[in-house]
């Protein structure tokens, strides 16, 4: 015998209290597949979470994060604080990148500047907290007699010594 509940489409549930007829999901609930015996409660996007897509009778609400935060986890289960470029998020909040490291995004960690000399290249543009160094041509690529493009070592910025 076919289960009468299998005829209930998405957006409804099979109501055992009413002879297994298909009843619409109540407000603030949904069923995304047919044959459901209950509807699921809609996700509420509250606080730091904002509604990206409203809940419908057949699909759950989708959330993202209010400005200043970004999503983490499946389905944006968490909102993590943004930092400024040139910073990284630590247990004590946003902290400036240490000298010799950079972060060009509002999330993630500070990464070491590229070591141009490992590729036999010279530094064309110094690194900053927000930007990696730009490597120039290797000294061998320079025409004879051309002056070096390697600028002097950058002075340490006050307040940005290694922590």
């Amino acid at each position: 015998l076919q289960d009468p509940c299998s005829n209930c489409p998405a957006g409804t549930f099979c109501d055992n209290n009413r002879n297994q007829i298909c009843s619409p999901c109540p407000p603030n609930s949904f069923s995304s597949a047919g044959g459901q015996r209950t509807c699921d409660i809609c996700r509420q996007c509250k606080g730091v979470f904002r509604t990206r897509k409203e809940c419908s009778s057949t699909s759950n609400a989708e959330c993202d994060c209010t400005p200043g935060f970004h999503c983490l986890g499946a389905g944006c289960s968490m909102c993590e604080q943004d930092c400024k470029q040139g910073q990284e998020l630590t247990k004590k909040g946003c902290k400036d990148c240490c000298f010799g490291t950079f972060n060009d995004q509002k999330r993630g960690i500070c990464r070491p500047w590229t070591n141009c000399s490992l590729d036999g290249k010279s530094v064309l543009v110094n690194g900053t907290k927000e930007r990696d160094v730009v490597c120039g041509p290797s000294p061998a690529d320079l025409s004879p007699g051309a002056s070096s493009v390697t600028p002097p070592a950058p002075a340490r910025e006050p307040g940005h010594s290694p922590q």
Epitope: F69, L72, S77, M78, C79, E80, Q81, L89, G93
Partner: nanobody, 121 residues
Framework: QVQLQESGGGLVQAGGSLRLSCAAS????????IGWFRQAPGKEREGVLC????????YYADSVKGRFTISRDNAKNTVYLQMTNLKPEDTAVYLC??????????????WGQGTQVTVSS
């Protein structure tokens, strides 16, 4: 039952002060941070300030630095947002949330309903 209840909002003139309270019940208050957010009419909700379980402050909004401070009284399960030199652009509904950590909020975190702050010029 978990509850966060904001109070202390009201109407104040520009340059004035208000102290908002966020009173918590139904969970181990000492283990949680408390973050304040605000939503002005027609604008995105924005983070304001947060206090960690150990008492450290995190400013989410640069615009409130030097004007707003945050403190907590674990004996009273309450966090206070002291707002001074208020400006008309501070007008908003202020609500508090209780994450484990000021830098990361979960969809399971607790939130209050909010209290209205109106700053007239």
């Amino acid at each position: 039952q978990v509850q966060l209840q904001e109070s202390g909002g009201g109407l104040v003139q520009a340059g004035g002060s208000l102290r908002l309270s966020c009173a918590a019940s139904g969970f181990t208050f000492d283990d949680y941070a408390i973050g304040w957010f605000r939503q002005a009419p027609g604008k995105e909700r924005e983070g304001v300030l947060c206090i960690s379980s150990s008492g450290g402050s995190t400013y989410y909004a640069d615009s409130v630095k030097g004007r707003f401070t945050i403190s907590r009284d674990n004996a009273k399960n309450t966090v206070y947002l002291q707002m001074t030199n208020l400006k008309p652009e501070d007008t908003a509904v202020y609500l508090c949330g209780a994450p484990r950590d000021c830098s990361r909020y979960s969809s399971d975190d607790y939130w209050g309903q909010g209290t209205q702050v109106t700053v007239s010029s």
